[in-house]
Amino acid sequence: PGPPPGPPRVSPDPRAELDSTVLLTRSLLADTRQLAAQLRDKFPADGDHNLDSLPTLAMSAGALGALQLPGVLTRLRADLLSYLRHVQWLRRAGGSSLKTLEPELGTLQARLDRLLRRLQLLMSRLALPQPPPDPPAPPLAPPSSAWGGIRAAHAILGGLHLTLDWAVRGLLLLKTRL
């Protein structure tokens, strides 16, 4: 009367799941570092660059020790979604100067998207509560000048680099507690 039921779904080893997420994060971290260095070579940065629309850094000096897995993954996913949006905006509105960073920016965008999907999968595999769908974000205003686009690129890549470092540190610390 129909096929026999399949084998019960084996709960994956959370450490192995985290390992593959950490690998993707480390790989993206290296890509981001390389691209930020490329940007600095072509358009040297004069001091720190900020962009109000970027997420605030998810960490403070004491925060790493108190991390919990659901909080890390939820916050990381939210921040990376924002960075994905900013990278897409940079490619679309960044101006001709930033065309010299293609195809690397495109590769970065694709890898960022892949990491986000990986985080989504990890959260469902670990049966963590899924965050509500993100409200539509207001559109990002185009940079006021070519130099504005370059400053934005410095801010986006610098912030992403720091966020990914925080992510690797947090995920590896959490792994030691599993």
Partner: antibody, heavy 119, light 111 residues
Framework: EVQLQQSGPELVKPGASVKISCKAS????????MDWVKQSQGKRLEWIGD????????IYNQKFKGKATLTVDKSSSTAYMELRSLTSEDTTVYYC????????????WGTGTTVTVSS | DIVLTQSPPSLTVSLGQRATISCRAS??????????MHWYQQKPGQPPKLLIY???NLESGVPARFSGSGSGTDFTLNIHPVEEEDAATYYC?????????FGGGTKLEIK
């Protein structure tokens, strides 16, 4: 030239604390983590922990929690390690070392600071 | 913590010959083509110096006679042809997990 210049040798009494400094030059201080490594007399290397100079986030080897405290002063590109409740076991050389973000390999090493604990 | 065991503890190699140093990890430090193993050289009275990172990438300024290979739990540092200035102690180090740990070292002597 990229350099990490450490403070000089320290002679301290058992139970006391010591603070070692490591001044970075020749690179952007906030682009790398600062890690600390202990080299015991038998030449064994042990990772103590690291700090991200951007926001002061630290990670410690469980073995050194409560023994070492890592801090940075971004304005002077200097990292510090304080060691407390010193015993003869802590007599050895300590290195600061530049760590690649997220990858923990160490491409630049400090000059080393010898700490001697003796009454 | 992952334990790294180096062999041999000491090694004597003739000038111009090949030196091979092994490092075995107590669990795999590789996945998806990435291996988080690194090699350092240390001479007496000096700090360690990075030679090879991520298994096989030569640090800038390091001579091409140094090479690294391996995956999973077994890694190798090769030096060929060995020169007099290569007399030193060599350490492997992993960064797969926290905390990163180092091997016990291999002392290379040249004859």
């Amino acid at each position: 030239e990229v350099q990490l210049q450490q403070s000089g040798p320290e002679l301290v009494k058992p139970g006391a604390s010591v603070k070692i400094s490591c001044k970075a030059s020749g690179y952007t201080f906030t682009d790398y983590n600062m890690d600390w490594v202990k080299q015991s007399q038998g030449k064994r290397l042990e990772w103590i922990g690291d700090i991200n100079p951007n926001y002061g986030g630290t990670i410690y080897n469980q073995k050194f929690k409560g023994k070492a405290t890592l801090t940075v002063d971004k304005s002077s590109s200097t990292a510090y390690m304080e060691l407390r409740s010193l015993t003869s076991e802590d007599t050895t050389v300590y290195y600061c070392t530049r760590g690649e973000l997220g990858h923990w390999y160490f491409d630049v090493w400090g000059t080393g600071t010898t700490v001697t604990v003796s009454s | 913590d992952i334990v790294l065991t180096q062999s041999p503890p000491s090694l004597t190699v003739s000038l111009g010959q090949r030196a091979t140093i092994s490092c075995r990890a107590s669990k795999s430090v590789s996945a998806s083509g990435y291996s988080y193993m690194h090699w350092y050289q240390q001479k007496p009275g000096q700090p360690p110096k990075l030679l090879i990172y991520l298994t096989s990438n030569l640090e800038s300024g390091v001579p091409a006679r140094f090479s690294g290979s391996g995956s999973g739990t077994d890694f190798t540092l090769n030096i060929h042809p060995v020169e007099e200035e290569d007399a030193a102690t060599y350490y492997c180090q992993h960064s797969w997990d926290l905390p990163p740990t180092f091997g016990g070292g291999t002392k290379l002597e040249i004859k």
